[in-house]
Structure formats: C-alpha cells, structure tokens
Interface confidence: low
C-alpha cells in the first residue's frame, strides 16, 4: 500500500512568492514621472517577476516632521488621486498581485514615528487601516519600529484590525535592528507578523556564519513563518559586492520563508554606480536613458532592456529562481535542514512529503572547493541519494539537466548550486 | 540521440509568409532554450530567433523583429519560425539548433542543428 | 551589433600541419558575470555547423584534443595541431556575450 501523504499546511498568498518593495514611486519609474498611473503601467514587469505582492509607498501626505500635516488617509497629490489608487489595485488584482501598503508615517522626516507624540500618531495609525483596508489593500508595513515606544504592544492591535478584517490581509513591520534577542521580542506577542529586518546584512563573509545565522533564527522562531531579506528597505547592492548577487537571490529564494526584495534587486541597481543618486533610493534602470545625468554611465547590462535581453543576466535568474518558488511544493511550504559540507560553504535541503527535493550549495568564498556534503547530519526523512540533477548553478557554463555525483562536487568561487532529485521511500 | 527534423521551406514571393516547423527528439524538449539560425547563400551565418524553455520569453536581432516570431509546443516536441512580409534578403537555408547548456537561454555553443530547410525569396 | 572578423579567408595546408585561425572582435567579449562566449564551428561541405569549442577553450564531446581554442577581450584563435582530411571544411566563430548574436565570416581549412 502507498504511503498515505502528508497533509498540506494551510497556505496564504504571502507564502507563495516574493514581495517587491517600491518605496520610492518617483526613483522606481524615473524621468520626472512617479505617480499611480505610471506604476499601473509597470504591473506587467511585476508580474514578469513572478512575485507576488507589491509594498508600495509610504504615499501619503507628510511635511516633513509635522504631525498635523500628516494624513495617512490622504493620498499625497504629486503621486496620484485616491481613484488612481483604486485602479492600480484593481489593474494588480487582475494580474493576481497583492498591494501592501506603507505606513510609516512621517516618512520624509528626520524621526518615522514623531518621538513626541506617539499616542496620537498610534490613533492615526488605526484609522489608517481600517480606512484602507475598506478601500482594499492586502496588507501593510511600518518600517523603523525601534523608534516606536512600546512596539509590541501597538503591533500586537494594529495585528488584530489587520487580521481582524480578513485572516488574508498580512502586516509587516521593519526594523534596523540586526539583533536576534530585540527581532525575537518583537515577534514574541505577534504571532502572524512578518519582520523585516538587518539581521542577515552582516552574513556575507563565509558560508559558516551565514548557515550559524540561518539555523539560528529558525530555531529560534520555530514554526512560525518567517521572511528573508537583508534589511527592511535597501537594496542588497548596499551590502553585498556584485559577485554574490546571484548566491543570495539563491538563497533568499531557496530558505523556508518569503523573500522579499526591494525594486532593482533583480537587476542588481547599485546606487554607487550612480553618482548623485542617494543610496536609499536610486533611480530604476529601465534603459539606458534612464540616468541621463552622466553619458555613459550606464551600459545596457545594467538595465531592465538589457538584462532582459540577455538570458544570462542577473534579472533572468531572479525570474527563473522565482517561478520555481512559486510552483515547487518542497520550496513552496517544505522542510528545511541545513548540513555540513565543508569550510566555506552553506548547504541544505528541501523537501516536501513525496514530492520532488531540492538540495542548495553555497559557496561564499573566493576560491573553488570540493564539496564534503556529511549526510550523517540529516535524518532518514531526508537522505541525500548519490546523485542530483542540476537545476540550475549561479555561474555559467555547466551542463543543467545533467546528474551530479555529490560525492565529487566541486563548487567556483561565489558559486550556487540548485539541485533537484526524486523522493525515494 | 538529440535529432533535429526542419520542414516548410520552399519558394515564396516578396511579401510574401512562410512557417518552418522543427521536430525535435532525443532529449526533453521542455528543458532547452531553441534558436533558429539561417545561413545565406554567401554562406553567412546569422542568428535568426531565440525561444525560453517554457516559451514565455522570445528575443529576435533588430532586423528581424516584427517580421518573425518563434514559438514552441512542448507537447509536441516541435520548434516554429513564422515569417512574414519576406524579402529577397531572407533567401537562406533556415536551420534550427539546441544549445549545449540551458543556464537561462545564454548561448554556450549550439551544440545541435538540424540539416536545415531552404527558404527562397523570389519573384 | 557586434562585428567578427576572421582571418585568413583561406588557409592551404598539407595533411598533419598545424593550423592557426584567427577571430577577432569589435568589441570585448568579456561578460559581466566574468565569461568570455566565444565559440568555434566546423562546416564540411553539404553538412550543417558543428560545434567545436565553446567558451574560448573548452572542447565539446567528441571533438578530438588536435584541437584547441585560446584568447581573450577581443582576440582568439583556433589551431589544429596536426590537420587530418577529416578536419577540412569551413571554419567559423561566434559570439554570444551580446545581443544580438554573431558570427565570423568563415575561414575555408583546404589542401594545399
């Protein structure tokens, strides 16, 4: 007789696929344009991605520093009109993309959360979302909430309107913290919160750290989702050096959780590339001419035109990786375990009941290795077999589709590698 | 062994439309990024269409985009170039290749082609 | 579009002479993620191209070890070491770094 299968987990819309911030309307579209309309045009990029929910904004009215002057029920008219809005949500509807919508309330000034006045900011918080919750957002995020007093317990109600609305609308919170004990006081009385935080920022010096910070977090979280970014809002060029892009889109889209990715990521927009460009905030590569400041800064390998031109790009891998997030039971919902397989090098499996598994080896470093993966640190449930199919390697030039003996595996420097093999009973 | 079957040449009128199919066999189609690639009677070779794995993403030269479109059934195993508003210049012998690698589509030789279908332009 | 040029158009040898072909680019093709697609291709007469080397240097199955590519940034070359009846034919290379792809002119490898 078959074994009987194991009983899928309930799953929401946020544990299928990437989230893809767009904090600054004007740097994401670029030539003097950054309105609700202009985004609505972009929804076919987005959906090119696969991801599946947009953070947008913060987009409502704020002078800066000024709480009377702050309105999160209005929407600033440099970015559009609340029927602009309306459209763009029904439009990313349409296109199966969920909005999540930013908070933070004073955005444009010097403290997110205006220090003194915290009870009258919270109230406003509240009407916020019930507002637009009514209006029909999926969902929200507040960044920088280590400047907000008393945190938890303002996440812990804003949870309960949240939820309270639909256990389908999602609530996200940033933080700059890259502290384990602060990130986990924060989750401790909000039991469906996704955090954003730095806590991965400092992991790109060996595989070791990285795999200790991984398996720390999940053990400390236990069974609750969790999201994987590098930080609450800025782009993974402000942390890593180009040649380890590819590496973490792979591991990103490959750990027990949500990725989530802020506009450019999937190009590898670096601000420092950009000269004059702030780097919270660069302008959007779309083409060429899309940073007229200095001729020739930009070459077409660093744009959406020509990334998406070129199979091999940076961008073509981020789709690639998240269609696989996105339809792949094992990366979608299933079991992770993390195992030794040398110095240098973070590795872990996948897998999800019968379905098909999925091994990921990370080498962090800058000289090839030969892997030792030591399946003694796995139990029976996920054995290694002697071979796995290539999926897909973050370098060039091996032959995907073909078996790779596990024995003998030799990574490149800074190389990745997704392998696929069958259940076996 | 990896067979590549091209048919649907022939002779045709400026102006006019054709559609090149390829069969493909001896591997799993569904995994390979394909091209068409044509070589002119000067014996010129020119990359003609790429086509993704899943047949999501297509990428042509300047010269060819709007006139040509490639696609692809995966339950078939077949390959097609559809051509239209042909000129005299399009005169060639039209082969369809499969790369060594499938790493997204980047070309790391074309490792496999057809024996080729003539195409000819002419009044 | 990137332009190749081979070099020379023709190249006489006798039976187990080595052979050098030259390939030159217009333009680097060095790829951002640090790989050079740089191929070599052998027509004989009435058959399709096959490939021989691809990524500068590295010879696909089959191919026997007379042959061997070289080069970098913009200029390669393809030599035979010793050139068998079998390896006659055109010659072309290839690039794949840019959109859109190209291909050399061809050198024709004939007896002298």
């Known amino acids: 007789r078959a074994p009987r299968c194991r009983e899928l987990p309930a799953q929401k819309w946020w544990h299928t696929g990437a989230l893809y911030r767009i904090g600054d309307l004007q740097a994401f579209q670029g030539h003097g344009a950054g309105n609700l309309a202009g985004l609505k045009g972009r929804l076919d990029y987005l959906s090119s991605l696969k991801v599946k929910g947009l953070v947008l904004g913060p987009i409502h009215k704020n002078q800066k520093d000024d709480v009377a002057q702050t309105d999160l029920l209005q929407i600033d008219p440099n970015f559009g009109s609340k029927e602009d809005f309306d459209s763009l949500l029904q439009s990313a509807k349409k296109k199966s993309i969920r909005v999540i919508l930013d908070l933070t309330p004073n955005y444009r000034g010097e403290n997110s959360w205006f220090s003194t006045q915290v009870d009258t900011v919270a109230t406003k918080v509240k009407d916020a979302l019930e507002f637009w919750l009514q209006a029909g957002v999926d969902g929200f995020q507040v960044r920088d909430i280590e400047n907000l007093k008393d945190a938890s317990s303002f996440l812990a109600e804003w949870q309960n309107i949240t939820k309270g609305f639909s256990e389908d609308r999602l609530l996200i919170a940033g933080t700059n913290s890259s502290d384990l004990q602060q990130i986990l006081s924060l989750l401790e009385s909000n039991k469906d919160l996704l955090l954003t935080s730095s806590y991965l920022s400092d992991s790109g010096s060996t595989g070791e750290h990285t795999k200790s910070l991984v398996t720390q977090y999940l053990n400390a979280t236990g069974n609750r989702w969790c999201s994987w970014s590098l930080s609450q809002a800025r782009l993974l060029t402000s942390f890593l050096p180009a040649q380890l892009l590819r590496l973490y889109q792979l591991m990103l889209f490959t750990l027990p959780g949500t990725p989530v990715f802020s506009y450019g990521d999937e190009i590898g927009l670096d601000a420092a590339a950009l000269p004059g460009q702030p780097m919270e905030a660069p302008v959007m590569l779309w083409d060429e001419s899309s940073f007229p400041d200095i001729p020739g800064a930009v070459s077409a390998n660093m744009t959406v035109k020509g990334q998406s031109e070129d199979p091999g790009s940076l961008l073509s891998l981020f789709r690639r990786l998240s269609d696989q997030r996105s339809k792949e039971r094992s990366l979608l919902h299933g079991d992770f375990h993390a195992f030794s397989a040398g110095p240098g090098l973070f590795s872990y499996i996948r897998h999800w009941d019968q379905n098909e598994r999925f091994l990921v080896v990370l080498n962090f470093g800058d000289v090839g290795l030969s892997a030792g993966l030591q399946a003694s640190d796995l139990p029976a449930s996920a054995s290694l077999p002697a071979k796995a199919d290539l999926l897909l390697s973050t370098q060039p030039g091996r032959e995907e589709g073909s078996p790779l003996e596990l024995e003998r595996l030799k990574l490149e420097p800074h190389e990745g590698l997704l392998l696929r093999f069958p259940y076996a009973a | 062994q990896v067979q590549l079957q091209e048919s649907g040449g022939g002779l045709v009128k400026p102006g006019g439309s054709l559609k090149l199919s390829c069969a493909a066999s001896?591997?799993?189609?569904?995994?390979?990024?394909m091209y068409w690639v044509r070589q002119t009677p000067e014996k010129r070779l020119e990359w003609v269409a790429t086509?993704?794995?899943?047949?999501?993403?297509?990428y042509y030269p300047d010269n060819m985009k709007g006139r040509f479109t490639i696609s692809r059934d995966n339950v078939r195993n077949n390959l097609y170039l559809q051509m239209s508003s042909l000129k005299s210049e399009d005169t060639a012998m039209y082969y369809c290749?499969?790369?060594?690698?499938?790493?997204?589509?980047?070309?790391?030789?074309?490792?496999?082609w057809g024996q080729g279908t003539l195409v000819t332009v002419s009044a | 579009d990137i332009v190749m040029t081979q070099s020379p158009l023709s190249l006489p040898v006798s039976l187990g002479d080595q052979a050098s072909i030259s390939c030159r680019s217009s333009?680097?093709?060095?790829?951002?993620?640090?790989?050079?697609?740089l191929h070599w291709y052998l027509q004989k007469p009435g058959q399709s191209p096959k490939l021989l080397i691809y990524?500068?240097?590295n010879r696909f199955s089959g191919v026997p070890d007379r042959f061997s590519g070289s080069g970098s940034g913009t200029d390669f070359t393809l030599k035979i070491s010793r050139v068998e009846a079998e390896d006659l034919g055109v010659y072309f290379c290839?690039?794949?770094?840019?959109?859109?792809?190209?291909f050399g002119g061809g050198t024709k490898l004939e007896i002298k």
């Open positions: 086509i993704s794995d899943g047949g999501s993403y297509a």
């Open positions: 990524k500068v240097s």
């Open positions: 290749a499969r790369d060594r690698a499938y790493y997204y589509g980047s070309s790391y030789g074309f490792a496999y």
């Open positions: 290839s690039q794949s770094t840019h959109v859109p792809y190209t």
């Open positions: 333009q680097s093709l060095l790829h951002s993620n640090g790989n050079t697609f």
């Open positions: 001896g591997f799993t189609f569904s995994d390979y990024y």
